[in-house]
Interface confidence: low
C-alpha cells in the first residue's frame, strides 16, 4: 500500500508535514478501539487521502480519522501540537495502545496544566515526580484513580513508580491504611504489598476482591493469613455464609485447604450451586478487538498467580478454562490420588480427563489409572482399551467406583483388558470380580470360561452361578469336580451342588448312591438329557425327603420330560400321584434321532403297533 505524500497538516507550525500521522495502522495492532467506537458499530478508520488534501486543525478530525498513528510521526511535532493531539484524542474518546500513550507522554515534556483535558490513561505514563507539590499531586492522583491501571503490567516501570508517589502524596506512613486512603489509591490499591494486607485487612481485603489481575505471591499469603485469622470484615471461615462467599469472589482462588475445610460444607455447596447458575459468573467477553487467533490464545493463558502448585480444594473455584490453562497435566498425573477427595463437578472432571488424554495419548500408565477414582466414570471403552492394567489393586480401586451399579461397558472393557493381560482368570481375580459382580462368571462365554483354572473355582459362590446357562455350566462343572475331588461325600456335595447344571447322567447316578438329599431347586437346574435316563429309584435316592416336591413340578422341565420316560407303575411306587408315565403294555422305542429333535421319547401306542403288542401279550401270558 502506498503512503500518502507528505504535506503541511498543522497550519503555521512549520514542522515537517505528517503525511501518515493519522494513517490507519489497525491491522498492525496499533490501536484497540473502544467498544462504542469500533466494537458494536462496526466503524472502521476512514481513508486519509481526502483529509490530507485539505488539512483542517486536529480537533476537527473525526474519531475514525484519529484511529491510528505511529510514534515516529509524533516525534516530529512540537509539544504544543502533541498537547493538541492528546486533547483531541480525549475529546473523541479514542482508545490508544500502550505504545501510543507512552509515546505521547514522552513528548509532553513539561507537566501539563489542564490534566482534565488529557486522555485519562495517558496520565499513567506521566512521571509523578513532575507533580510534587501537595496540590499538584492531589490533582494528579485524583485523576489517576479513575484511570485503568491495568493497561500497565505489574512489572512496568511506569506502574511501579506510581504507588510510592501516591502513598507519599496522600500522607500514608507505615502500613496502616484508612478506608479513605484505600479509596484515594483507586486501582493502585491492588499493588499494595503483603504488609499492608496484613495490617489493614479490614479495609483492604474488600478492595482486593475486585482487583482485575491476580494477586502476587506476597499478597496472596497475607490475604490467606488474614482470612484464616478470622478477623473483620469477614470473620472466622467457620461462620461464613453464602453472602460471605459472594463478597469474597475475587479472593476465592487464594483460599488454601485449611480455610476451605473450615467453611461449613453446606455453605460451599449452596454457594457453588447458586454460582453455577448465576450468569454473572460467566467469563466476561473480551471487549478489545483483536485478531481472532489472539483471543483464543489469551483464553488459554493462565492468569498470573493462578498456576496450580498442587491439586487441592481451591481448584473447585476455577472455571473450566482456568483449570485447562492453570493445571499442569504432569502435576495432575502425579497427584491423581487427591482428585477423588475434591468435589469437582462433572464438567470440571471433563477438563481434567482432557488434560490426561493430552499427556498420555497412547493410554494412561497404571500409576495414574489406579488413582482415577470417579474420573474412571468419564472414560470410554475406547480409552480403556489403550490401558495395560496388571495390578489387582488397580482393578479393585476402579471396580469400587462403579460399586452398586450394573456392569457398564467401561467395566466390562476393563475386566476384559485385565483378564487378557493375565492370561487366565486366577482365583484372586475371580474372587475380586465376583465380589463386585456376582453375575460376572455367567457373563463370560464358554470359550472364555475355559481359561478358568480349576483352582479358581474355590472362589465361586452359589449366587455367582445363578444366571449361568447350561453351556456355561458344562464348562465349569468338570473344573469344579476336579477342584473338589479330594473332599468327602457330604462336603463335596455342598461345594459341587451349584455346578450340577453341567453334570452328566453317570455323575448324577453316582450322587444318588451318596444319600445327598438334593433340593428341588437344584434338581430343576439339571440338564434334561442327564436326568432322563435316571430311574425312579435313582431319583428317589437323589432327592431323599425332597422327592415330594416332584408333584409340584410335574408340568415343568426336566421333571415333565422325565415322567414321560418312566413306567407309570414305577411312578406310582412314589405315592405322589404323578401322572403321564408309560402305561403298562406300552413299548418304549428309543429312537434317538427323533428324541433329539422332539425332546420326548417315541411311544408306540395301540393301532400302528398291534403286532408288537400281540407279541408282548403272548410273551407275558407264556
Amino acid at each position: 500500500m502506498a503512503l500518502p505524500t507528505a504535506r503541511p497538516l498543522l497550519g503555521s507550525c512549520g514542522t515537517p508535514a505528517l503525511g501518515s500521522l493519522l494513517f490507519l495502522l489497525f491491522s498492525l495492532g496499533w490501536v484497540q478501539p473502544s467498544r462504542t467506537l469500533a466494537g458494536e458499530t462496526g466503524q472502521e478508520a476512514a481513508p486519509l487521502d481526502g483529509v490530507l488534501a485539505n488539512p483542517p486543525n486536529i480537533s476537527s478530525l473525526s474519531p475514525r480519522q484519529l484511529l491510528g498513528f505511529p510514534c515516529a510521526e509524533v516525534s516530529g511535532l512540537s509539544t504544543e501540537r502533541v498537547r493538541e493531539l492528546a486533547v483531541a484524542l480525549a475529546q473523541k474518546n479514542v482508545k490508544l495502545s500502550t505504545e501510543q500513550l507512552r509515546c505521547l507522554a514522552h513528548r509532553l515534556s513539561e507537566p501539563p496544566e489542564d490534566l482534565d483535558a488529557l486522555p485519562l490513561d495517558l496520565l499513567l505514563f506521566l512521571n509523578p515526580d513532575a507533580f510534587s507539590g501537595p496540590q499538584a499531586c492531589t490533582r494528579f492522583f485524583s485523576r489517576i484513580t479513575k484511570a485503568n491501571v491495568d493497561l500497565l503490567p505489574r512489572g512496568a516501570p511506569e506502574r511501579q513508580r506510581l504507588l510510592p508517589a501516591a502513598l507519599a502524596c496522600w500522607g500514608v506512613r507505615g502500613s496502616l491504611l484508612s478506608e479513605a486512603d484505600v479509596r484515594a489509591l483507586g486501582g493502585l490499591a491492588c499493588d499494595l504489598p503483603g504488609r499492608f494486607v496484613a495490617e489493614s485487612a479490614e479495609v483492604l481485603l474488600p478492595r482486593l476482591v475486585s482487583c482485575p489481575g491476580p494477586l502476587d505471591q506476597d499478597q496472596q499469603e497475607a490475604a490467606r493469613a488474614a482470612l484464616q485469622g478470622g478477623g473483620p470484615p469477614y470473620g472466622p471461615p467457620s461462620t461464613w455464609s453464602v453472602s460471605t462467599m459472594d463478597a469474597l469472589r475475587g479472593l476465592l482462588p487464594v483460599l488454601g485447604q485449611p480455610i476451605i475445610r473450615s467453611i461449613p460444607q453446606g455453605i460451599v455447596a449452596a454457594w457453588r450451586q447458586r454460582s453455577s447458575r448465576d450468569p454473572s459468573w460467566r467469563q466476561p467477553e473480551r471487549t478489545i478487538l483483536r485478531p481472532r487467533f489472539r483471543r483464543e490464545v489469551e483464553k488459554t493463558a493462565c492468569p498470573s498467580g493462578k498456576k496450580a502448585r498442587e491439586i487441592d480444594e481451591s481448584l473447585i473455584f476455577y472455571k473450566k478454562w482456568e483449570l485447562e490453562a492453570c493445571v499442569d497435566a504432569a502435576l495432575l498425573a502425579t497427584q491423581m490420588d487427591r482428585v477423588n477427595a475434591i468435589p469437582f463437578t462433572y464438567e470440571q472432571l471433563d477438563v481434567l480427563k482432557h488434560k490426561l488424554d493430552e499427556l498420555y495419548p497412547q493410554g494412561y500408565p497404571e500409576s495414574v489409572i489406579q488413582h482415577l477414582g470417579y474420573l474412571f466414570l468419564k472414560m470410554s471403552p475406547e480409552d480403556i482399551r489403550k490401558w495395560n492394567v496388571t495390578s489387582l489393586e488397580t482393578l479393585k480401586a476402579l471396580l469400587e467406583v462403579n460399586k452398586g451399579h450394573e456392569m457398564s461397558p467401561q467395566v466390562a472393557t476393563l475386566i476384559d483388558r485385565f483378564v487378557k493381560g493375565r492370561g487366565q482368570l486366577d482365583k484372586d481375580t475371580l474372587d475380586t470380580l465376583t465380589a463386585f459382580y456376582p453375575g460376572y462368571l455367567c457373563s463370560l462365554s464358554p470359550e472364555e470360561l475355559s481359561s478358568v483354572p480349576p483352582s479358581s473355582i474355590w472362589a465361586v459362590r452359589p449366587q455367582d452361578l445363578d444366571t449361568c446357562d447350561p453351556r456355561q455350566l458344562d464348562v465349569l462343572y468338570p473344573k469344579a469336580r476336579l477342584a473338589f475331588q479330594n473332599m468327602n461325600g457330604s462336603e463335596y456335595f455342598v461345594k459341587i451342588q451349584s455346578f450340577l447344571g453341567g453334570a452328566p447322567t453317570e455323575d448324577l447316578k453316582a450322587l444318588s448312591q451318596q444319600n445327598v438329599s438334593m433340593d428341588l431347586a437344584t434338581f430343576m437346574k439339571l440338564r434334561t438329557d442327564a436326568v432322563l435316563p435316571l430311574t425312579v429309584a435313582e431319583v428317589q435316592k437323589l432327592l431323599g425327603p425332597h422327592v415330594e416336591g416332584l408333584k409340584a413340578e410335574e408340568r415343568h422341565r426336566p421333571v415333565r420330560d422325565w415322567i414321560l420316560r418312566q413306567r407309570q407303575d414305577d411312578l406310582d411306587t412314589l405315592g405322589l400321584g404323578l401322572q403321564g408315565g408309560i402305561p403298562n403294555g406300552y413299548l418304549v422305542l428309543d429312537l434317538s434321532m427323533q428324541e433329539a429333535l422332539s425332546g420326548t421319547p417315541c411311544l408306540l401306542g395301540p393301532g400302528p403297533v398291534l403286532t408288537v403288542l400281540a407279541l408282548l401279550l403272548a410273551s407275558t401270558l407264556a
Partner: nanobody, 130 residues
C-alpha cells in the same frame, strides 16, 4: 427460598418402626437433573452421620452399614417428599434426624457420602427406648 420440613419423629420401643417424611418447598426434587437426597442423624456428643441417601436420577440408594436392611429411603416426586422408613429400631438409633438436599452433584458424590448438602431441615427427634 428452599425449606425442608421433617416430620414423623417420636418415641418408640426397641424393635418398633417409624416413618420420617421430609417435605420441600421452594424447590422441586424432580426439577433438577442431578441431586442427592439424604437423611442424616446426630446423637448428643457425636458427629453427624449420613444414614441414607438416594440419587433419583438412577434410583440408586446408599445406606450406612449400621442401618442396612432395617431402613429404607424413598421419594415421592408428586408430593415433593422424601421418606425414611425405619424398622427394627434399636436404642442406638436415638438421635436428631435431619433431611438434606445436595443440588447439582453427581451420583458419585451421593454414593460416597461426600456430597455437599446445601439445604438442611430443622430436624426431627427419634428416641428408641429399651
Amino acid at each position: 427460598q428452599v425449606r425442608l420440613v421433617e416430620s414423623g419423629g417420636g418415641s418408640v420401643q426397641a424393635g418398633g418402626s417409624l416413618r420420617l417424611s421430609c417435605a420441600a418447598s421452594g424447590y422441586t426434587y424432580s426439577s433438577y437433573s442431578s441431586n442427592c437426597l439424604g437423611w442424616f442423624r446426630q446423637a448428643p456428643g457425636k458427629e453427624r452421620e449420613a444414614v441414607a441417601r438416594i440419587y433419583p436420577n438412577s434410583g440408586s440408594t446408599y445406606y450406612a452399614d449400621s442401618v442396612k436392611g432395617r431402613f429404607t429411603i424413598s421419594q415421592d416426586n408428586a408430593k415433593n417428599t422424601v421418606y425414611l422408613q425405619m424398622n427394627s429400631l434399636k436404642p442406638e438409633d436415638t438421635a436428631m434426624y435431619y433431611c438434606a438436599v445436595a443440588v447439582g452433584v453427581g451420583d458419585n458424590w451421593c454414593a460416597s457420602g461426600a456430597a455437599y448438602f446445601g439445604y438442611w431441615g430443622q430436624g426431627t427427634q427419634v428416641t428408641v427406648s429399651s
